[in-house]
């Protein structure tokens, strides 16, 4: 795996442990937490940063309206199991014995049971809508600038194909993303769109996955684009199995049939 | 550290060009605006404008509008203002100060230059 | 524009003491920013986002407000804290400063 081989550490993940014990006594990176060698050429799987993360010491209507099958990360952190490529277990369980189904993104998309539940396959998460609010500029943005310079991010940090970023939409303050990426579009080699978001999740907290790198500065034609809020929906290509209660009273959307969280990201 | 170093005082005649350099060292350059501020004998702080080296983006104070050019060089990780049609009240300290901002925080104008005064006298 | 009026223009104090500088804005502002000038010094940012000390900034510099409404504090002045203090306001163009406030040695 290739990784910076003059200091011997993860551009793409300060969450490893490196050393130059790979063959020939190149740099070999592993992911906290899990020990599972990560590629350094491209992003780690979002399970195995979850999975590090929880092993870290503690300190005119242009947009889209979610739809009715929509998921928002509603349960925060959790420890997952990982499968040996990185990619999340179908079947997630806690230390209590309670378990639930999770979509390739490691979102939970049944009720939770116990150890009998089963969950025949990983749903794919084939869409991705993230909701993002700016703050205030002096100056405005203008759209096809806004446009390009997220596509150009998604390229360029995130190593995502142009192609699975489908629209970036826009109305003051918020602006809207969509990624799409279905199984049969997605070559060996591709970032996975559920991985890209996560890390573009963390940068807009102020909480950069990359090695040695300064937050985020995104500028459109020189303006900094500041987020105040961000919101994300991922849609599965089966629909989630929530019992009717939740869906008609348990979630926080009122009423609605999405599993509805808003992340204060600030 | 990161440091702006600005060219050495001038005197000019009314109606006349000044060009002021600014040299930024200690970060990469491209990533963060150039802001240039004037300071007048005995008055407060002005805003001129900012330059962003990494696209040449620029936004000027309409009140200096047609008068002031922000120019950058790269490859010297110089950013110039040149201000024409000099008049006596064109005397001042003229700052350029770089703006490091990240999606989360804007994060002022930090450090400046030392300075250039720029004196326009008959 | 956004006129910025910082009150008092000059304040008389005695090292020790706790200095309270305010900025008003002719329009509401989401952020203010606040420098510290010194004679023949360049400016010094001290506070970025109304109320994050810059780097480098002591503790007993902090700021607060919002709206139209900003306030720097010092809460013990120290002798190489006498200077002349400028609100700043990044909401809209042209960028703007306050006219100044200036601490000095009662």
């Known amino acids: 795996h290739t990784a910076a081989q003059d200091n011997c550490t993860c551009p793409t993940n300060k969450m490893t442990v490196c050393s130059p014990d790979g063959p020939g006594g190149r740099c070999q990176c592993r992911a906290l937490g899990s020990g599972v060698a990560v590629d350094c050429s491209t992003l780690t799987s979002k399970c195995l940063l979850l999975k590090a993360r929880m092993s870290a010491p503690k300190n005119a209507r242009t947009l889209v309206r979610p739809n009715e099958h929509a998921l928002v990360d509603n349960d925060g952190l959790y420890d997952p199991d990982c499968d040996p490529e990185g990619r999340f277990k179908a079947r997630q369980c806690n230390q209590t014995s309670v378990c639930w189904c999770v979509n390739s993104v490691g979102v939970r998309r049944t009720d939770k049971g116990d150890l009998s539940l089963r969950c025949d396959e990983l749903v794919r998460t084939h869409h991705i809508l993230i909701d993002l609010r700016h703050r205030p500029t002096a100056g405005a943005f203008n759209h096809s600038d806004l446009d390009a310079e997220l596509r150009r991010l998604f390229r360029e940090r995130y190593r995502l194909h142009p192609k699975f970023v489908a629209a970036v939409h826009y109305e003051q303050p918020t602006i809207q993303i969509e990624l799409r990426q279905n199984t049969s579009q997605k070559a060996a080699g591709d970032v996975d769109i559920g991985d890209a978001a996560y890390y573009f999740e963390r940068d807009v907290k102020g909480e950069s996955l990359f090695q040695g790198r300064g937050g985020l500065d995104l500028r459109v034609r020189g303006e900094p684009l500041q987020v105040e809020r961000t919101l994300i929906y991922y849609l599965d290509e089966i629909p989630p199995k929530f019992s009717m209660k939740r869906l008609t009273g348990g979630g926080s959307g009122g009423g609605s049939h999405h599993h509805h969280h808003h992340h204060h990201h600030h | 550290q990161v440091q702006l170093v600005q060219s050495g005082a001038e005197v000019k005649k009314p109606g006349a060009s000044v060009k002021v350099s600014c040299k930024a060292s200690?970060?990469?350059?491209?990533?963060?605006?150039i802001n240039w501020v004037r300071q007048r004998p005995g008055q407060g702080l002005e805003w001129m404008g900012w330059i962003y080296p990494r696209d040449g983006s620029k936004k000027y104070n309409e009140k200096f509008k047609g008068r002031v050019t922000m120019t950058v060089d790269t490859s010297t990780s110089t950013v110039y203002m040149e201000l024409s049609s000099l008049r006596s009240e064109d005397t001042a300290v003229y700052y350029c100060?770089?703006?490091?901002?990240?999606?989360?925080?804007?994060?002022?104008?930090?450090?400046w230059g030392q300075g250039t005064l720029v004196t326009v006298s008959s | 524009e956004i006129v910025l009026t910082q009150s008092p223009a000059t304040l008389s104090l005695s090292p020790g003491e706790r200095a309270t500088l305010s900025c008003s804005a002719s329009s509401s502002v989401n952020y203010i920013y606040w420098y510290q000038r010194k004679p023949g010094q360049a400016p010094r940012l001290l506070i970025y986002?109304?109320?994050n000390l810059a780097s480098g900034i002591p503790a007993r510099f902090s700021g607060s407000g919002s709206g139209t409404d900003f306030t720097l504090t010092i809460s013990s002045l120290e002798p190489e804290d006498f200077a002349v203090y400028y609100c700043?306001?990044?909401?809209?163009?042209?960028?703007?400063f306050g006219q100044g406030t200036k601490v000095e040695i009662k």
């Open positions: 200690g970060y990469t350059f491209t990533s963060s605006d």
């Open positions: 700043q306001q990044w909401n809209s163009y042209p960028l703007t």
């Open positions: 986002d109304t109320s």
């Open positions: 100060a770089t703006r490091f901002a990240t999606v989360v925080s804007n994060y002022g104008l930090d450090p």
